[in-house]
Interface confidence: medium
């Protein structure tokens, strides 16, 4: 009569799944904050820093009411993929000045990668539609100078911190709606 059936597959509790994602996001938020502070101490920022290749802000107070889990996770994953690419670029092309931020920048990259894999897993566990494979992004041009690399680092870490900050709030809110 064949082998006995295996134990019934327990469907994951979506709130618990989301909880662990929130914890990872909070942890990365704290790491980013510390690294941004370290960067400010070593290379004080004069004014604001922008990088056109960074994603535009996805969330604000007004957007919270209409949040839907699939949209948030898809957008968050896309934005964090972009930040991962920018962190990788910064480590490669940022110049010798930014080597003083190692190994912290490498740790940040690894944790960002881990959060992305966690988001991917969460989306499949919750049976959310998987986003299409990401089109190859155009390569980022190397900074024009050492100071250009430092300005880019301020923009990348500042943008990532803001994105993660809103992500924590959005994910906490979505958890209450599950």
């Amino acid at each position: 009569p064949g082998p006995p059936p295996g134990p019934p597959r327990v469907s994951p509790d979506p709130r618990a799944e989301l909880d662990s994602t929130v914890l990872l996001t909070r942890s990365l938020l704290a790491d980013t904050r510390q690294l941004a502070a370290q960067l400010r101490d070593k290379f004080p920022a004069d004014g604001d820093h922008n990088l056109d290749s960074l994603p535009t802000l996805a969330m604000s107070a007004g957007a919270l009411g209409a949040l839907q889990l699939p949209g948030v996770l898809t957008r968050l994953r896309a934005d964090l993929l972009s930040y991962l690419r920018h962190v990788q670029w910064l480590r490669r092309a940022g110049g010798s000045s930014l080597k003083t931020l190692e190994p912290e920048l490498g740790t940040l990259q690894a944790r960002l990668d881990r959060l992305l894999r966690r988001l991917q897993l969460l989306m499949s566990r919750l049976a959310l539609p998987q986003p299409p494979p990401d089109p190859p992004a155009p390569p980022l041009a190397p900074p024009s100078s050492a100071w250009g690399g430092i300005r880019a680092a301020h923009a990348i870490l500042g943008g990532l911190h803001l994105t993660l900050d809103w992500a924590v709030r959005g994910l906490l809110l979505l958890k209450t709606r599950l």
Epitope: L57, S60, A61, G158, G159, L162, R169, L172
Partner: antibody, heavy 117, light 110 residues
Framework: EVQLLESGGGLVQPGGSLRLSCAAS????????MNWLRQAPGKGLEWVGV????????FYADFVKGRFTISRDNSKNTLYLQMNSLRAEDTAVYYC??????????WGQGTLVTVSS | QSVLTQPPSASGTPGQRVTISCSGS????????VNWYQQLPGTAPKLLIY???LLPSGVPDRFSGSKSGTSASLAISGLRSEDEADYYC???????????FGGGTKLTVL
């Protein structure tokens, strides 16, 4: 360095109007939601309202709805609070503050508004 | 009457550990992040704790936050005279669609 500098406070009669400004510098103003909060003399903190980074959404505390309006000019890095139909109980130090998520991470030094006849 | 409830005062001697409580409901603390602010005499408030227990850069790790259910607390260990200030808890309230604060706790270092 992030800086927020409020101005426009002063003495105004009950029923009168006043417009407060908050000049922002040291960060990309157009990326952040901005708030107004207030503190009556000797009292606690009170949230007045928030405007989203692109001005598309605004939320207000019940006690100011219909009387106060928050606006911003991202090209000038400035936040505004238009206060109409002022009452004695609106007397307070008014603060602008930046919101990156659920909290106020930077505050201005405040500007005093006194409503009295 | 504040939406969040804090004791009006707290005190301790230098080196001691003090805790300030903040209680709310499911529509604010229960469902949303709790933040704490410190207001030194005559100055603007300053962010002390965000997302329940995270410290902004520059805040010493003598300060810590925690949350359980609809209550939160702020702990200060190794109390110093410069910690004498007003402390406020805060959270978003889903019912009111806005930010609510506790009435504030005046901390005295004896």
């Amino acid at each position: 360095e992030v800086q927020l500098l409020e101005s426009g406070g002063g003495l105004v009669q009950p029923g009168g109007s006043l417009r407060l400004s908050c000049a922002a510098s040291g960060f990309t103003f157009s990326h952040y939601d901005m708030n107004w909060l207030r503190q009556a003399p000797g009292k606690g903190l009170e949230w007045v309202g928030v405007i989203s980074y692109d001005s598309s959404n605004k939320f207000y505390a019940d006690f100011v709805k219909g009387r106060f309006t928050i606006s911003r000019d991202n090209s000038k890095n400035t936040l505004y609070l238009q206060m109409n139909s002022l009452r004695a109980e609106d007397t307070a130090v008014y603060y602008c503050a930046r919101t990156p998520g659920s909290h106020f991470d930077y505050w201005g030094q405040g500007t005093l508004v006194t409503v009295s006849s | 009457q504040s939406v969040l409830t804090q004791p009006p005062s707290a005190s301790g001697t230098p080196g001691q550990r003090v805790t300030i409580s903040c209680s709310g409901s499911s529509s604010n603390i229960g469902n949303n992040a709790v933040n704490w602010y410190q207001q030194l005499p005559g100055t603007a408030p300053k962010l002390l704790i965000y997302y329940d227990d995270l410290l902004p850069s520059g805040v010493p790790d003598r300060f810590s936050g925690s949350k359980s259910g609809t209550s939160a607390s702020l702990a200060i260990s190794g109390l110093r005279s410069e910690d004498e200030a007003d402390y406020y808890c805060s959270a978003w309230d889903d019912s009111l669609n806005g930010v609510v604060f506790g009435g504030g706790t005046k901390l005295t270092v004896l």
